[in-house]
């Protein structure tokens, strides 16, 4: 089938990094500066990617794949192939339309990105709070309250050891 | 109707120095992304330099960088290409041509002409 294809369209047989040149009875030429062909037959090459102002190139364009832009210090990629800059905030903060905001009391955010989440509630697992929360870090949960009344031991005593080679019976 | 007309090769020593000209007629050089490609003996076009509106730069290819150097007189309607430091691998046809944009969003050049040869030979 390819034979058969690359008899009747000389195009198929142009790699990546050129066009196929219609002009020129179908030679494969060479992609223009600042352009690409990802893949081989194709009749024009696509512009490359240009990283510019919040943007920064993380990789060039070549004339077979195109650029790949990431952000500048201070801002993180959305979106895919990073279609999108957001502003970093610090932790214990999150993103609104007005800028970097602290969190509320009984939220926290741990990263420079996304929003503050409530802290868990330990009361929900039957559990109590051993260390508070901050805007920055959420809740420790430690053992319920019925693991810690008198004569109740949190630790689990140890497996009886066998004796090697003797089976349990 | 567009042309473009390669003038200034020549033979020239190792070493030695050239001045291309390409001058344009029917349509507007300073308007467009405009260049020079060059197809040595047996072997593939390969694009040499450039000047690129919508890049907002000037390209050269690793080989020339350095050595090469593209510009335009828009009064004259005419782009250069100044070569200098020759080497016997700068043989080739050297074709100016202008980069194509089209509607879909695609990319190609077209170029006119029968080119000029420049050959670097002692």
């Known amino acids: 089938f390819e034979r058969t294809r690359s008899l009747q369209d000389p195009c198929s047989n142009c790699p990546a990094g050129t066009f196929c040149d219609n002009n020129r009875n179908q030679i494969c030429s060479p992609c223009p500066p600042n352009s690409f062909s990802s893949a081989g037959g194709q009749r024009t090459c696509d512009i490359c990617r240009q990283c510019k102002g919040v943007f920064r190139t993380r990789k060039e364009c070549s004339s077979t794949s195109n650029a790949e832009c990431d952000c500048t210090p201070g801002f993180h990629c959305l979106g895919a192939g990073c279609s999108m800059c957001e502003q970093d905030c610090k932790q214990g903060q999150e993103l609104t339309k007005k800028g970097c905001k602290d969190c509320c009391f009984g939220t926290f955010n741990d990263q420079k990105r996304g929003i503050c989440r409530p802290w868990t509630n330990c009361s929900l697992d039957g559990k109590s709070v051993l260390v508070n929360g901050t805007k920055e870090r959420d809740v420790v949960c430690g053992p319920s309250p019925a693991d810690l009344s008198p004569g109740a031991s949190s630790v689990t005593p140890p497996a009886p050891a066998r004796e090697p080679g003797h089976s349990p019976q | 109707e567009v042309q473009l007309l390669e003038s200034g090769g020549g033979l020239v020593q190792p070493g030695g120095s050239l001045r291309l000209s390409c001058a344009a007629s029917g349509f507007t050089l300073s308007a467009e992304d405009v260049g020079w490609v060059r197809q040595a003996p047996g072997k593939g076009l390969e694009w040499v330099s450039a000047i690129l509106d919508f890049g907002g730069s000037t390209y050269y290819a690793e080989s020339v960088k350095g050595r090469f150097t593209i510009s335009r007189d828009n009064a004259k309607n005419t782009l250069y290409l100044q070569m200098s430091s020759l080497r016997a691998e700068d043989t080739a046809v050297y074709y100016c041509?202008?980069?194509?944009?089209?509607?879909?969003?695609?990319?190609?050049?077209?170029?006119w002409g029968q080119g000029t040869l420049v050959t670097v030979s002692s």
């Open positions: 041509a202008r980069v194509v944009y089209h509607a879909g969003g695609g990319v190609t050049f077209d170029y």
